[in-house]
């Protein structure tokens, strides 16, 4: 019903986009399949903090950047906020997404991360800190701050379902995606599944949920057959290149 | 460790406002999106609203939209709930959880309206 | 919204049995969004699994998720005394995220 917002599963073939994409207007209804109803305008979501600008948050940008308002260099309140490029080892931060991959957030400067971000096979018991009571190593603040011990301890990485900070936190096959007001991982696309092409970076912001993207080998394109009156309504769908 | 530590109930006239507020310690707050969710006495647990790590997106139960206002304060590590127009209804401990699926809880906060 | 429908609603059995509580959804949930909670009187809930079969940290492994589509199980293989409680589903696939009504887990 329309009381109900439904995600779309990347295990659900062929389904318009329900926001942000091809998939009808905010506002909208889009009927999907039989007894599923994509709301396009989210009835539960509230935009009273958000600017439409080009991003909200760090996760609308590309892997090698970070939201923020460009006049302070980190995220704050009010004031137009944009994808910034990400900080190599040795610039100031303020948190981990400031930094480039590979690199973390060490007492404000970007520093390199020894264990390649999330380690998730074998690392020291002391690096994980808040970790250890985190029921997913992706979720928590895991990053080296002492190196005293050297017990060993395992994470594996996240599952579909789990929370996450970045993709590289999610097993294979899953990215680490938007859904509502968390993060978690979600299934990479396969070939026809619905996707989401944005005509720029940050464009995304309204969404209330993101996809994956298409996994190897495929591109986000318009699908050949689907005619629609209106070129920025068109269904997107994985295709191979 | 990861501590979520909720204040701010107490008895309130119907009509009247409250401020909720969680303190949050032991994991980075800005990295988490942040739920309330409500459990009348006797009864299960109701969802009440969640805003996103940079508090860029708030989302509410249809129950207290338009009368509850989620927001959060990074540089505190504080999470807050406004509740203006309250009733009787919303009497509640009123628990403040992290993520999505609450991986965290406070030990929550009783919300009582009542004449 | 999505409904869950949780049962039985209240399980009698003896330390050592097995326990198998039901959540089942009114739509199908097409990915496994769906957690299970142990609650205790007097206390906050506790996660025990998430992503449909994932256990939280410092639950033991007695405690196991299974299912997708509409049925979700969580099972306790061998019942301690301190499980005895009422456990709640929650599905975070839409908005709005909804709980099960719970099911109590009582000594016999």
């Known amino acids: 019903t329309l009381n109900s917002v439904l995600i779309n599963s990347n295990a659900i073939k062929n389904l318009p986009p329900p926001l942000g994409g091809a998939g009808g207007q905010p506002g909208s209804a889009v009927s999907v399949a039989p007894g599923v109803l994509y709301e396009g305008g989210n009835k539960y979501q509230t935009l009273d903090n958000y600017q439409p600008y080009p991003c909200a948050e760090d996760e609308e940008c590309g892997s090698d950047e970070y939201c923020s308002s460009p006049s302070r260099g980190a995220a704050g309140v009010g004031g137009v906020q944009i994808c910034l490029a990400c900080r190599k080892r040795r610039k100031r931060c303020m948190r981990h997404a400031m930094c480039c991959p590979g690199n973390y957030c060490k007492n404000g400067i970007c520093m390199p991360s020894d264990h390649s971000h999330f380690p998730r096979g074998e690392i020291e018991e002391s690096i994980i800190e808040n970790l250890g009571n985190d029921h997913n190593a992706a979720a928590g603040d895991g990053y080296p701050r002492r190196t005293t011990l050297t017990s060993k301890i395992y994470h594996t990485k996240g599952q579909e379902g789990s929370v996450c900070l970045r993709s590289s936190d999610c097993a294979a096959g899953l990215c680490c995606a938007r859904h509502f007001w968390s993060k978690i991982c979600k299934p990479v696309l396969k070939e026809g599944q619905v996707c989401t092409k944005h005509k720029r970076k940050g464009s995304h912001g309204l969404e209330i949920f993101q996809r994956c993207y298409c996994g190897e080998g495929l591109a986000c394109r318009i699908q050949k057959d689907h005619h629609q009156a209106s070129n920025s309504s068109r269904l997107h769908t994985c295709q191979r290149h | 460790q990861v501590q979520l530590v909720e204040s701010g109930g107490g008895l309130v006239q119907p009509g009247g406002s409250l401020r909720l507020s969680c303190a949050a310690s032991?994991?980075?707050?800005?990295?988490?999106?942040m739920t309330w969710v409500r459990q009348a006495p006797g009864k299960g647990l109701e969802w009440v609203s969640g805003?996103?790590?940079?508090?860029?997106?708030?989302y509410y139960a249809d129950s207290v939209k338009g009368r509850f206002t989620i927001s959060r304060d990074n540089s505190k590590n504080t999470l807050y709930l406004q509740m203006n127009s309250l009733r009787a209804e919303d009497t509640a401990v009123y628990y403040c959880?992290?993520?999505?699926?609450?991986?965290?809880w406070g030990q929550g906060t009783l919300v009582t309206v009542s004449s | 919204d999505i409904v869950l429908t949780q049962s039985p609603a209240t399980l009698s059995l003896s330390p050592g049995e097995r326990a198998t509580l039901s959540c089942r959804a009114s739509?199908?949930?097409?990915?496994?969004?769906l957690a299970w909670y142990q609650q205790k009187p007097g206390q906050a809930p506790r996660l025990l699994i998430y992503g449909a079969s994932n256990r939280a940290t410092g639950v033991p492994a007695r405690f196991s998720g299974s299912g997708s589509g509409t049925d979700f199980t969580l099972t306790i293989s061998s019942l301690e005394p301190e499980d005895f409680a009422v456990y709640y589903c929650?599905?975070?696939?839409?908005?709005?995220?909804?709980f099960g009504q719970g099911t109590k887990v009582e000594i016999k």
């Open positions: 739509q199908n949930l097409f990915s496994p969004y």
């Open positions: 805003i996103s790590g940079s508090g860029s997106y708030t």
């Open positions: 032991g994991f980075t707050f800005n990295n988490y999106g």
């Open positions: 929650q599905q975070y696939l839409s908005l709005p995220t909804t």
């Open positions: 959880a992290r993520t999505i699926y609450m991986d965290y």
